[in-house]
Amino acid sequence: QGWQAFKNDATEIIPELGEYPEPPPELENNKTMNRAENGGRPPHHPFETKDVSEYSCRELHFTRYVTDGPCRSAKPVTELVCSGQCGPARLLPNAIGRGKWWRPSGPDFRCIPDRYRAQRVQLLCPGGEAPRARKVRLVASCKCKRLTRFHNQSELKDFGTEAARPQKGRKPRPRARSAKANQAELENAY
């Protein structure tokens, strides 16, 4: 039979196809960002500089369940998802189409997690198994942070995974966490 949905008074943000969360569109060779995909605004010139305050780094609240194998949290947890562009995309021609959203020769600003918080959750398991306790790391705030050429690629990978659009109609895969991170993943079903 599987799990029954847990009923509670938590607010649930429900993603609909092609809506929330919406990662930046992929860039194809010899194309600038499609206006329709960019909220109707024309794309910025690649080397245009603007004050960071002119760009939006939004904190979207999503309610998710934590899972660990067949076990799932009794209550959902609310996490922030950092969304928005902090500055013009700085692209080099050889980076186009590969989801690289930085220009190595100049600084870049990203809307990325700023602070995290730890939350203890109780996981309920099927088959009368005893509940498990897990501690999960959740995003607590977002910030426009400056990246430079000195940030190595592994660091950029953490900031840049949003740049790859999930296959249409398919569930976006949760980002792989480091070995130190929690085994309990946040289920992408808000």
């Epitope: 949905a5 607010t11 429900i14 993603p15 609909e16 196809l17 909220g39 249409k168 109609g169 289920e187």
Partner: antibody, heavy 109, light 112 residues
Framework: CQSVEESGGRLVTPGTPLTLTCTVS????????MGWVRQAPGKGLEYIGI?????NTYYPTWAKGRFTISKTPTTVDLRITSPTTEDTATYFC?????WGPGTLVTVSS | DVVMTQTPASVEAAVGGTVTIKCQAS??????LKWYQQKPGQRPKRLIY???TLTSGVPSRFKGSGSGTDFTLTISDLECGDAATYYC??????????????FGGGTEVVVK
């Protein structure tokens, strides 16, 4: 390729329960929410309710008790528990920009 | 439950003109708002989501703005094909005690 299609609309007498089915293809219902919307002839759109990826259902106050939404991995059902003539409408299921063509329900004695 | 109030109910404008449709939510819905266009006998077509993000393929003549409780859809350089009924729809967070989904009453746009 994604598609959404409703079925089950027909002429029913008042008080006879009716279940409409929304069949989807290429859409992961364990992740995306699917809503039901209706439109009476010559009237505006009316939101009936939505079922989330994890199976939670949400209805506006006017629809609670009158409708029940449930799902399987590839279908989403809308049950009209006790139809009245006011429930005569075209019923759509939708997620994001994907809407079915609608199915017509006529309630008449 | 959130209630969406849309104004005006009907508006007439000439080809090449501009139309502004307003939508007000009974409570703050952040930017969880969509705009739809519906022509007679057709299913609704989403124009805008997240209050201001244009659906791919929709002309940039359609512009959505606003957040919180007040939202606007502006259609500029009106074309004959823009004649339709336009609806706003909230898709804010829902809980067992409150549904964040509702449509506005619709605005009929007549193009002269």
């Amino acid at each position: 390729c994604q598609s959404v299609e409703e079925s089950g609309g027909r002429l029913v007498t008042p008080g006879t329960p009716l279940t409409l089915t929304c069949t989807v293809s290429g859409i992961d219902l364990s992740y995306y929410g699917m809503g039901w919307v209706r439109q009476a002839p010559g009237k505006g759109l009316e939101y009936i309710g939505i079922i989330s990826g994890i199976g939670n259902t949400y209805y506006p106050t006017w629809a609670k008790g009158r409708f029940t939404i449930s799902k399987t991995p590839t279908t989403v059902d809308l049950r009209i528990t006790s139809p009245t003539t006011e429930d005569t409408a075209t019923y759509f299921c939708a997620t994001g920009d994907f809407w079915g063509p609608g199915t017509l329900v006529t309630v008449s004695s | 439950d959130v209630v969406m109030t849309q104004t005006p109910a009907s508006v007439e404008a000439a080809v090449g003109g501009t139309v502004t449709i307003k939508c007000q939510a009974s409570q703050s819905i952040s930017t969880y708002l969509k705009w739809y266009q519906q022509k007679p006998g057709q299913r609704p077509k989403r124009l805008i989501y997240s209050a201001s993000t244009l659906t791919s393929g929709v002309p940039s003549r359609f512009k959505g703005s606003g957040s919180g409780t007040d939202f606007t859809l502006t259609i500029s350089d009106l074309e004959c094909g823009d004649a339709a009924t336009y609806y706003c729809q909230s898709n804010a967070g829902s809980s067992s005690s409150s549904c964040g989904y509702a449509f506005g009453g619709g605005t009929e746009v007549v193009v002269k």
